[in-house]
């Protein structure tokens, strides 16, 4: 029985050209996390494997950085990055847990203050 729950950063509104962190946290289960996939729509952005570490998809290498933790940092945001992002936790023995985060990327005049900083 799958007892775990995924908590996310929550939906985010960010500024074009800026950076944001997407994070998920799996709680309420003792299942072992074997791999975390980060996806947008049907595109794989990155994989964090418990044994093999991080793999960033070649098409996102310039703009996606691993971490912090099992999270993902998106840099040099464009309006085209607006959309839904998925953290997919592969666990044993529970199976798969999925978290969802919607990111809205706006021109600088309307982006929320909290997401305006650049992450080093």
């Amino acid at each position: 029985m799958m007892t775990g729950t995924i908590e996310t950063t929550g939906n985010i509104s960010a500024e074009k050209g800026g950076s944001i962190i997407l994070q998920c946290h799996l709680s309420s289960t003792t299942a072992q996390v074997t791999q975390v996939n980060w996806e947008q729509q049907d595109q794989l952005l990155a994989i964090c494997n418990a044994d093999l570490g991080w793999h960033i998809s070649p098409s996102f290498k310039d703009r996606v950085a691993p971490g912090p933790g099992l999270g993902l940092t998106l840099q040099s945001l464009t309006v085209n990055d607006t959309g839904e992002y998925f953290c997919i936790y592969h666990t044993y023995p529970d199976g798969t847990y999925t978290g969802r985060i919607f990111l809205e990327v706006l021109e600088s005049s309307v982006a929320e203050h909290g997401a305006r900083f650049q992450i080093p």
Partner: antibody, heavy 119, light 112 residues
Framework: EVQLQQSGPELVKPGASMKISCKAS????????MNWVKQSHGDNLEWIGL????????SYNLKFKGKATLTVDKSSSTAYMELLSLTSEDSAVYYC????????????WGQGTSVTVSS | DVVVTQTPLSLPVSFGDQVSISCRSS???????????LSWYLHKPGQSPQLLIY???NRFSGVPDRFSGSGSGTDFTLKISTIKPEDLGMYYC?????????FGGGTKLEIK
């Protein structure tokens, strides 16, 4: 003036599919998310999903995945929601609603489209 | 999904009354950047829902200042300071912080 004009009421048979349109005017269509909301049983409001006109990206309430398909035609500034394999449970009023930038709220709503599923 | 609970379900009022509607969520509506996406709507019979308040406490354009929103975390309140006839209808809160967005069950504001 921002306006969202929806297509008229529909009476459809169980098992059929149908498409509701929502024509936007008075603003830059590609600059704002478009949401779809179901009002059933008089008072209950449910978020069906959204579409990003700029890139065609979608997000669905899992309850409506496979039931609703969202698309846009940028050339006519129109959003569409197709409802599939209709049953009596799908009888409701459906609204399109523009997303308020930055705040994940819905600032302008269409007038609603009443859908009745009956044989 | 985040469960949003509104109270009361029904609110009988007299014109001129001050009323409060409560909205509670099953988890915090503050995102990791400290922004809280909680909005309020009025749905009058035969009309479309209309946005009243967004981001907890910001009045949408054209909304009278007798409407005010407050709260944080999981507890939020809509206050109407002096009820007028045009305020009657169903009030809904909506959380937009977590996917999927979810509405409260609604509060019916009606005459005593």
């Amino acid at each position: 003036e921002v306006q969202l004009q929806q297509s008229g009421p529909e009476l459809v048979k169980p098992g059929a599919s149908m498409k509701i349109s929502c024509k936007a005017s008075g603003y830059s269509f590609t600059g704002y998310i478009m949401n779809w909301v179901k009002q059933s049983h008089g008072d209950n409001l449910e978020w069906i999903g959204l579409i990003v006109p700029y890139n065609g990206g979608t997000s669905y309430n899992l309850k409506f995945k496979g039931k609703a398909t969202l698309t846009v035609d940028k050339s006519s500034s129109t959003a569409y929601m197709e409802l599939l394999s209709l049953t009596s449970e799908d009888s409701a009023v459906y609204y399109c609603a523009r997303g308020l930038q930055r705040f994940y709220a819905m600032d302008y709503w269409g007038q609603g489209t009443s859908v009745t599923v009956s044989s | 999904d985040v469960v949003v609970t509104q109270t009361p379900l029904s609110l009988p009022v007299s014109f001129g009354d001050q009323v409060s509607i409560s909205c509670r969520s099953s988890q915090s509506l503050a995102n990791s950047y400290g922004n809280t996406y909680l909005s309020w709507y009025l749905h009058k019979p035969g009309q479309s829902p209309q946005l009243l308040i967004y981001g907890i406490s910001n009045r949408f354009s054209g909304v009278p200042d007798r409407f005010s929103g407050s709260g944080s975390g999981t507890d939020f309140t809509l206050k109407i300071s002096t009820i007028k006839p045009e305020d009657l209808g169903m009030y809904y809160c909506l959380q937009g912080t977590h996917q999927p967005p979810t509405f409260g069950g609604g509060t019916k504001l009606e005459i005593k």
